[in-house]
């Protein structure tokens, strides 16, 4: 699996992907905000 995430439970895998997506969205917003403020 591409980024080293390992879990034996499919629902846990889906949860991990959801958390990753949320963090990507939050970090993306912060990055955009920083660029905007420059």
């Amino acid at each position: 699996h591409s980024d080293g995430i390992f879990t034996d439970s499919y629902s846990r895998y889906r949860k991990q992907m959801a958390v990753k997506k949320y963090l990507a969205a939050v970090l993306g917003k912060r990055y955009k905000q920083r660029v905007k403020n420059k």
Epitope: I5, S9, Y10, S11, Y13
Partner: antibody, heavy 117, light 112 residues
Framework: EVQLVQSGAEVKKPGSSVKVSCKAS????????MHWVRQAPGQGLEWMGL????????RYAQKFQGRVTITADESTSTAYMELSSLRSEDTAVYYC??????????WGQGTLVTVSS | DIVMTQSPDSLAVSLGERATINCKSS???????????LNWLQQKPGQPPKRLIY???TRESGVPDRFSGSGSGTDFTLTISSLQAEDVAVYYC?????????FGGGTKVEIK
């Protein structure tokens, strides 16, 4: 309504590779879990692996590890399953399927891959 | 891997009679999220499978209420309360709780 349309039937020689495509429409492609399942003639179903296109994150069945590669092109809403080192036992109908609620809610029409010398 | 054992392999039932298919898993399918990812599929000749039941007992929208799923842990049942001609198909259970996802061998339902 989600629709999955797969590429046409293929005839391949032993030792070669095959790449099957699955084009999705009617949903948000990047935010789905796209699975591949195969069915040998007159046999049951066998899970091969999945991809989560938003991160291109993949998970493969142990049986196919090292021989299967699942990819996705978000720009065309298309997933691909490539199986290498083909043998006669790989003759099967290959299906793509989309997960909803932890279960395969939508299926492609299937692609018959025949491996024969 | 989780082994899914379906029984019987085939079943001949008269129209209007009850058909019962059993499915047993080698490990509990109850997930840490409280859900049981046991699913039932129907497959007619030359067609892709179709989802009938998920979460062990939740019927897919549009599926007739003569189809019902029950069970928990490792033992599950699909019941067709009154068999219709259009129900002739192969039925598969499969588990989506644990990697690798695994399927039962299928049960062929025919009319007696």
């Amino acid at each position: 309504e989600v629709q999955l349309v797969q590429s046409g039937a293929e005839v391949k020689k032993p030792g070669s590779s095959v790449k099957v495509s699955c084009k999705a429409s009617g949903g948000t492609f990047s935010d789905v879990y796209m699975h591949w399942v195969r069915q040998a003639p007159g046999q049951g179903l066998e899970w091969m692996g999945l991809i989560y296109p938003i991160f291109a994150d993949t998970r493969y069945a142990q049986k196919f590890q090292g021989r299967v590669t699942i990819t996705a092109d978000e720009s065309t809403s298309t997933a691909y399953m490539e199986l290498s080192s083909l043998r006669s036992e790989d003759t099967a109908v290959y299906y793509c399927a989309i997960d909803q609620d932890g279960s395969f809610a939508y299926w492609g029409q299937g692609t018959l891959v025949t491996v024969s010398s | 891997d989780i082994v899914m054992t379906q029984s019987p392999d085939s079943l001949a039932v008269s129209l209007g009679e009850r058909a019962t298919i059993n499915c047993k898993s080698s490990q509990s399918l109850l997930d840490s999220d409280g859900k049981t990812y046991l699913n039932w599929l129907q497959q007619k000749p030359g067609q892709p499978p179709k989802r009938l039941i998920y979460w062990a007992s939740t019927r897919e929208s549009g599926v007739p209420d003569r189809f019902s799923g029950s069970g928990s842990g490792t033992d599950f049942t699909l019941t067709i309360s009154s068999l219709q001609a259009e129900d002739v198909a192969v039925y598969y259970c499969w588990q989506g709780t644990w990697f690798d996802l695994t399927f039962g061998g299928g049960t062929k339902v025919e009319i007696k």
